[in-house]
Structures are given as structure tokens and as C-alpha cells.
Amino acid sequence: SGTTNTVAAYNLTWKSTNFKTILEWEPKPVNQVYTVQISTKSGDWKSKCFYTTDTECDLTDEIVKDVKQTYLARVFSYPAGNVESTGSAGEPLYENSPEFTPYLETNIGQPVIQKYEQGGTKLKVTVKDSFTLVRRNNTFLSLRDVFGKDLIYTLYYWKSSSSGKKTAKTNTNEFLIDVDKGENYCFSVQAVIPSRTVNRKSTDSPVECMGQEKGEFRE
């Protein structure tokens, strides 16, 4: 059939952070090439990464069209130099990916503390609103734009002189917390989507400490 030495892709895996979404698979090709197709449950399959020798395909442009849809991808294997060849069933070898729902599954990227400001016994910490590749009206949306109140941030903070951590939560990108006047604090933030069953939390942001040479205001 011409596909004697062609092997089907396996270990199809979605890698997605802040909706930047790549499908990866194995094996590294030997005398074969791959084409990827992606579809929602509509079954309107769209081909991407034509006849590639890569073992990954960036599907971001497709999934950002509707991040709440569920997607399936499939990877077709063709003999190198004979891409018209088909398998015994009259079609090229292919394997399906797991289903992927971006809104429910994309990893939330590590947040970044944009700035902090102290006024007396109040400390205001602002989390940078990361931009995604999701578009609306030709504008890239932020994580907050996409997730709305589904996204919360948790602030972990502690006095520089002690190890006892406190937490605060917000469904905006700002925290306003009570602190002891004259004390320096360290803090980090974590993004959380409580309604999720998987990938609920981001990794913690880098720790920021007051009174260090970066100063009290970061932009």
C-alpha cells in the first residue's frame, strides 16, 4: 500500500499556556512526514502544519477562535516523497489526540507583580494583567478579559523578619492589605481558577520584598 514503513503518531499531547497552544507527538520521523487536522465537535476538520517533519504543531490560531469549544486534533502520517499514498483502509494512517477545551485546560502562566505601594498601614499590590492570543475586535484580550470573575489571585505575604505566611484573595488584579507600619514585607501571587478540575493554579510569581533596591514602585 506504500505505507509499509509509515508509523502512526503516538503520545499526542496538548501543551498550552495562556491559550498559546501546541500539539506535540512522537516519533521523530524517519522517511515520513506529518499533517495535522483540528476540529471542534462540528467535525469541520481543518488541516495545519502540512507535510512537516516537526513533531509539534502550533494550533493557537484555531483554538483562540472560541476558547470554550472542545477540540480534537489528529495527526496523519505519510511516506516522505509519496504523500498521496494511503493505508489499507484507503486513507493515511492517523491518530487522534485527547480532547482539549482551552478555557478549562490551558495552563495559567506564572503571574508577575507589576507594582506595590505602601501608605501607612495599607499595602496595595497590583498583578500585571497578562495578555493572551485571544482576540476580540482585533484586540488581544488579557487573562482577566477572558476569564472574568472565574479568575482569582491569591497573595501570600509575610514579614521579612518572620516566616509566618498570610494570604489574601481578590477577583480583580489588586490587593489592599493591612500591614504593620515600618515593617518590610515579602510577597508572591498565584493565579487560581477555582471552578476548574484540572490546572487550577499557576506557579507562584517571583517573590518581591519591600525595601530592596528595586524600590517601592515597579512598572
Epitope: S39, S42, G43, D44, W45, A89, N96
Partner: antibody
Framework: EVQLLESGGGLVQPGGSLRLSCAAS????????MGWVRQAPGKGLEWVST????????YYADSVKGRFTISRDNSKNTLYLQMNSLRAEDTAVYYC???????????WGKGTTVTVSS | DIQMTQSPSTLSASVGDRVTITCRAS??????LAWYQQKPGKAPKLLIY???SLESGVPSRFSGSGSGTEFTLTISSLQPDDFATYYC????????FGGGTKVEIK
């Protein structure tokens, strides 16, 4: 509630034509591939045809290729099966089904009976 | 075309029995298999997809397993409502159904 309701079945002579319809409700029709499956009296299930959500992709079983045409009108939430050059072996209950990705059938209609006989 | 062979074609069992139905594919279909239940005069009902994923609303006594060419549908404790005909369906290459297994009262 997701519902599918087939209509258009009946008695037709060999060589004749029939058009089946399937009215869908309770879900966003254009978001799903749809299909037809049939069951001859006392027999098992046989896949007939599938159409993608946009109507741009269609698939047919070899037994009906060239004789049957699947189509859909997303503005009317309706699936169709135009059956031409009907044969006695096309006699069956025809089920309309919602088919995610065009792969498996997660919701079925009650079926409509097509009898091809002289 | 991929052929699907179910066995047995008929199975006699009693309420409370553990029932296993087998489906074999003529070539590897990975995990791209669904199971349906059909009662006389009624439309089929999806039980399992992707070989082992339980459809929403289906009782947990139903389970599916297998990959490649051999698959099983298991009913852990047969209930009166489970006497019916069961079909497997592959969706690796187009769609084909198995011939069916009728589960009847012993």
C-alpha cells in the same frame, strides 16, 4: 433537552425517491456533526452518512454512495437525507443522530421507517 | 473497511450477574470505540465512548475497557432494565458497527 425528530419515511417503489428530515432542538445545531444510521428489520445497525457542522464535509457508506445525499439547513436546525434509486435492501428504520466530531452518536432520534417494495 | 465482530451473539443471564461482552476489530482502532444499548422498538443509547469513557447519565455498573483490537463491555451487576441488545462501533476509519449481542433473561 436535546431532541431529534425524524420525518419523511413511508412506502416507496423500487427506483423511487424519498427525502427524510430531522428536526433538532435543545443544542446549537451548527456546532455538531450529524449523521444517519439505519436498521433493517431484525438486523443490526448500519451507518449511512455523516455531515459536518458547516455542511462542508460529507461521508457515505459504500452501500449508498451515489444514491443518497446528506445535507443540512443550519438556519432551520434541520438535517436531511435525500434517497434516490431506492432498493428493497434500503428498507429500514432510519435514525438521525448527533455525532460529535462525526465519530460517535451521543443523541438519537426515535427513527422513521422506510419501506421499499412494489 | 474495518470489521467489528461481537461475541457472543446471544447471552443468557440473571439479575445480579456480572456480564461481559467482547468486541474485536479487524485492525487496530486504538481506543476509538463506542458502546450502545438498544431495546426493542427503541433508538440506540450511547453508553461508552473512547473505549472506557462513561457517557453522562449512564449508571456506573457499565464499564468499557480495551484498546487496539480487543474491547469489552462489562455490566457489573445486571439489572432488570439491562436486558437489551448491545452494539459496539468503531470510529477510527469511517464508522462500522458490530453485529450486536442480545442479553436475555436466563
Amino acid at each position: 433537552e436535546v431532541q431529534l425528530l425524524e420525518s419523511g419515511g413511508g412506502l416507496v417503489q423500487p427506483g423511487g425517491s424519498l427525502r427524510l428530515s430531522c428536526a433538532a432542538s435543545g443544542f446549537t445545531f451548527s456546532d455538531y456533526a450529524m449523521g444517519w444510521v439505519r436498521q433493517a428489520p431484525g438486523k443490526g445497525l448500519e451507518w449511512v452518512s455523516t455531515i459536518s457542522g458547516s455542511g462542508g464535509l460529507t461521508y457515505y457508506a459504500d452501500s449508498v454512495k451515489g444514491r443518497f445525499t446528506i445535507s443540512r439547513d443550519n438556519s432551520k436546525n434541520t438535517l436531511y437525507l435525500q434517497m434516490n434509486s431506492l432498493r428493497a435492501e434500503d428498507t429500514a428504520v432510519y435514525y438521525c443522530a448527533k455525532a460529535p466530531y462525526g465519530y460517535y452518536m451521543d443523541v438519537w432520534g426515535k427513527g422513521t421507517t422506510v419501506t421499499v417494495s412494489s | 473497511d474495518i470489521q467489528m465482530t461481537q461475541s457472543p451473539s446471544t447471552l443468557s443471564a440473571s439479575v445480579g450477574d456480572r456480564v461481559t461482552i467482547t468486541c474485536r476489530a479487524s485492525q487496530s482502532i486504538s481506543s476509538w470505540l463506542a458502546w450502545y444499548q438498544q431495546k426493542p422498538g427503541k433508538a440506540p443509547k450511547l453508553l461508552i465512548y473512547k473505549a472506557s469513557s462513561l457517557e453522562s447519565g449512564v449508571p456506573s455498573r457499565f464499564s468499557g475497557s480495551g484498546s487496539g483490537t480487543e474491547f469489552t463491555l462489562t455490566i457489573s451487576s445486571l439489572q432488570p432494565d439491562d436486558f437489551a441488545t448491545y452494539y459496539c462501533q468503531q470510529y477510527k476509519s469511517y464508522i462500522t458497527f458490530g453485529g450486536g449481542t442480545k442479553v436475555e433473561i436466563k
